[in-house]
Structures are given as structure tokens and as C-alpha cells.
């Protein structure tokens, strides 16, 4: 099929006839078919989260009434351009990104609401938001300022091996340095009980008569 | 590196057709918008058509409306131009050009000669 | 359509002096989508400047770019012999995607 041509609109306009409030009226309503550019917004700055996931809203300001919207996230480092992922949507339905893609996304009107997933610290950058109104004719491209997304690695989690080894150690020691102490202690204690003496015992009176009991004298060599 | 080389150009009569080709190579075809801009003879740059990314869209000037058709093979990397009721007005050096991902005209093939003359 | 205008036809000047170069739109055009090329006789056009003001990759500083709205300028701070050419504008921010007529900058 060959290529169809662009509609043209031209206001014919006479403003002489109109008084001051009319034509202040007049541009203020037509504004947006003189400047025909489309702008987009989007936040400076974005943190990922801790996952590696950065969240942003992209909105257009559209020159004309597209029934079918491009959006592409552009990641731009050292004057290279490289495309992160992109999405066609018709006017009305779901914003809706190839299934490998690291985007996701959801539009309601002239808004998207964007997400990527598995950011890593190098991929810490402006992202930028293109817009292209790709149809009906003519078509629009709308370029948003950037977001610097910023991307913290976490703490990588240690090997779960590596820590039963810690754990193991750990507790090793723990055990020795107890089982050591106790040896200590008790070689300490049998000292303090067993004093140097000759060996002979002396019968004692008994403390208590009716308790009393016969105790014959005994030797306990001492090596 | 970015390389688009045209091919098909030459000498035809007024009302036939011809079939241009550019074959590109040294970067993701589908990503890009790929036009095709004249330049007749001693004149200025006028843009004739663009087809964007998958095909499924594809804008062209009010000069050629009807009378040219842009396509593009995405798995063989190439875009077409195929130009039917050809006029005298239509004799150029016709460029395939790469629309950058910003938008603006980054890469140009060397350009194919095209004369409608009986 | 968006028609782009370009001031002066011709520019003559010797190597060493400044050029100025002027591109008027019939409505305004934001800079993200303005740029400049520059055409060699039997060579296809090159990028010079993208978003009205910023370098393409390999393009020396003396040419620079400038304007917004309706008006904008190219800059050729000194001109060596090789810049000797015609150069045009352009904007890609809606379709038809239009360029300026040219200005053909020539030895003095």
C-alpha cells in the first residue's frame, strides 16, 4: 500500500473584527496549533530500591490526537545512546513490553508509568523517556530531560557454606575454650582441698553423741 | 561500525517504476527509524518517507503520496523504496538514512542516482 | 508543515573568520529537535550539531549551535579551508520532517 499524506489544518483566521478579551481568548486556545512540539516530563532523580528495581512516571503533553503511542526508555553515558526497552500501546488499552524485557509498565492517558528491574550499581545512568505519537499522521517525538537513576549494590550475602564454617569454628572454640577452663578450675580446686600434710589422721570427738560412730585410725600415703 | 549502502538506481522513462534497496549493517536494524531523502540535481534535501521500527508504520511526503511505497525486511536488515508512476520531478541522488534514537538524521548511505527521462 | 528558512543564500569569507549562520521556522520548533548537516560537492550530507546545540561525535569545536523557539544559529568560529560547504537545517520533531533550503558558505 502507498503512502498516504499528511492532513493539513489552516485556520483561516480574521482577527480585526474581534474586540481585546475575544483575542486574548483566541490565543490562549490555540496555542497548542502554533507550538507543535510535544514535551515530556519525568522526575531528575530516582533511587532504586535495594532489589535493583527504579520506578518513574513519564507524561507527555500531546500536540495532536494519537490513537497509537511508542515509548522507549533510552540510557544515555557518554554521549551513547543505547535503548533499554520499548512498548507500543493503542490510546485506552495496557502498556504492554516484549516478555524478556526488564521494563514494565502501565499507561493511564497521557501518563506511563515505568519500571526496571534488575538494576545493578553499573547500571547507575540517565534513563530518558522518548514519546512518538506514531499514528494517525503526522508524527509527533516527544523527548524527555532524564532521570539519573542511581543503583546501590547491597552487602552481598555471604555463602551459607562459608558460614556453617564460621558457625563451626566458632562453636569449636567455644567448646575447648570451656572444656580448658573447666580442667582449670577444677586442677585448681583438688589443690586447694588436698593440702601437703604427713599423712596422719587424729580421731575427733564427735559433734553430735547420738550420732556417734567408732572410727579406727588410718594412713593415707602421700606421693 | 554504522554502514548503509543503496543500490537499484538508474535511468527510467516517465510513469515506470523502479525499486531502490539499502542494506544496512553494524547495528539493531528493528530499533531504529530508517527515511529516505532526495536531493535533485543542484537543490536542496527533502525528505521522501520513513518507516519506523517493526513496519508497522510509515509516514511519507505529499510529493510522493501514492505514487511510492516504503518497506523494510527487518530480518535481512534492509529497506526498500519501490517508486511507481515515476516523473521528471523525481530525478535525485535518493539517501537511506538512519533516524538516531533521539531522533535526528546520524548515519547516511552514499546515495543512488535516480533519472526519469524518456 | 513546519518551513524552515535559511539567511544568508551565500556567505563568502576567507579561512580564519567567523561564520554565522541563520535558520528561521514558520513555528516554533523546540531544540531537542533542530539540527545541522554539512554537504561537500558528490558527498552525502554529514551531522554537525543534533538538539540545536550539541556536538555530533567527531565534530571539531568550532562549530557550535544556538537558538530556540523560532530562531536558531550555527557557528563557525574560525573557518578552515575544509569547511567550505553547504550547510543545512533541519527539525525531526514532526512529521514531514523538513530541511532548511541551505546556506552555501564560499571563498572569499
Known amino acids: 500500500m502507498a503512502c498516504l499524506g499528511f492532513q493539513r489544518h489552516k485556520a483561516q483566521l480574521n482577527l480585526a473584527t474581534r474586540t481585546w478579551p475575544c483575542t486574548l481568548l483566541f490565543f490562549l486556545l490555540f496555542i497548542p496549533v502554533f507550538c507543535k512540539a510535544m514535551h515530556v516530563a519525568q522526575p531528575a532523580v530516582v533511587l532504586a530500591s535495594s532489589r535493583g528495581i527504579a520506578s518513574f512516571v513519564c507524561e507527555y503533553a500531546s500536540p495532536g490526537k494519537a490513537t497509537e503511542v511508542r515509548v522507549t526508555v533510552l540510557r544515555q553515558a557518554d554521549s551513547q545512546v543505547t535503548e533499554v526497552c520499548a512498548a507500543t500501546y493503542m490510546m485506552g488499552n495496557e502498556l504492554t513490553f516484549l516478555d524478556d524485557s526488564i521494563c514494565t509498565g502501565t499507561s493511564s492517558g497521557n501518563q506511563v508509568n515505568l519500571t526496571i528491574q534488575g538494576l545493578r550499581a553499573m547500571d547507575t545512568g540517565l534513563y530518558i523517556c522518548k514519546v512518538e505519537l506514531m499514528y494517525p499522521p503526522p508524527y509527533y517525538l516527544g523527548i524527555g530531560n532524564g532521570t539519573q537513576i542511581y543503583v546501590i549494590d547491597p552487602e552481598p550475602c555471604p555463602d551459607s557454606d562459608f558460614l556453617l564454617w564460621i558457625l563451626a569454628a566458632v562453636s569449636s572454640g567455644l567448646f575447648f575454650y570451656s572444656f580448658l577452663l573447666t580442667a582449670v578450675s577444677l586442677s585448681k580446686m583438688l589443690k586447694k582441698r588436698s593440702p601437703l600434710t604427713t599423712g596422719v589422721y587424729v580421731k575427733m570427738p564427735p559433734t553430735e553423741p547420738e550420732c556417734e560412730k567408732q572410727f579406727q585410725p588410718y594412713f593415707i600415703p602421700i606421693n | 561500525q554504522v554502514q548503509l549502502v543503496e543500490s537499484g538506481g538508474g535511468v527510467v522513462q516517465p510513469g515506470r517504476s523502479l525499486r531502490l534497496s539499502c542494506a544496512a549493517s553494524?547495528?539493531?536494524?528493528?530499533?531504529?527509524?530508517m527515511h529516505w531523502v532526495r536531493q535533485a540535481p543542484g537543490k536542496g534535501l527533502e525528505w521522501v518517507a520513513v518507516m519506523w521500527y517493526d513496519g508497522s508504520n510509515k509516514h511519507c511526503a505529499d510529493s510522493v503520496k501514492g505514487r511510492f511505497t516504503i518497506s523494510r525486511d527487518n530480518s535481512k536488515n534492509t529497506l526498500y523504496l519501490q517508486m511507481n508512476s515515476l516523473r521528471a520531478e523525481d530525478t535525485a541522488v535518493y539517501y537511506c538514512?538512519?533516524?538516531?534514537?533521539?531522533?535526528?538524521?546520524?548515519?547516511w548511505g552514499q546515495g543512488t542516482l535516480v533519472t526519469v527521462s524518456s | 508543515e513546519i518551513v524552515l528558512t535559511q539567511s544568508p543564500g551565500t556567505l563568502s569569507l576567507s579561512p580564519g573568520e567567523r561564520a554565522t549562520l541563520s535558520c528561521r521556522a514558520s513555528q516554533s520548533v523546540s531544540s531537542s529537535y533542530l539540527a545541522w548537516y554539512q554537504q561537500k560537492p558528490g558527498q552525502a550530507p554529514r551531522l554537525l550539531i543534533y538538539?540545536?546545540?550539541s556536538r555530533a561525535t567527531g565534530i571539531p569545536d568550532r562549530f557550535s549551535g544556538s537558538g530556540s523557539g523560532t530562531d536558531f544559529t550555527l557557528t563557525i568560529s574560525r573557518l578552515e579551508p575544509e569547511d567550505f560547504a553547504v550547510y543545512y537545517c533541519q527539525q525531526y520533531g514532526s512529521s514531514p520532517f523538513t530541511f532548511g533550503p541551505g546556506t552555501k558558505v564560499d571563498i572569499k
Open positions: 538514512v538512519r533516524g538516531e534514537l533521539l531522533g535526528y538524521f546520524d548515519n
Open positions: 553494524g547495528f539493531t536494524f528493528s530499533s531504529y527509524g
Open positions: 538538539g540545536a546545540s
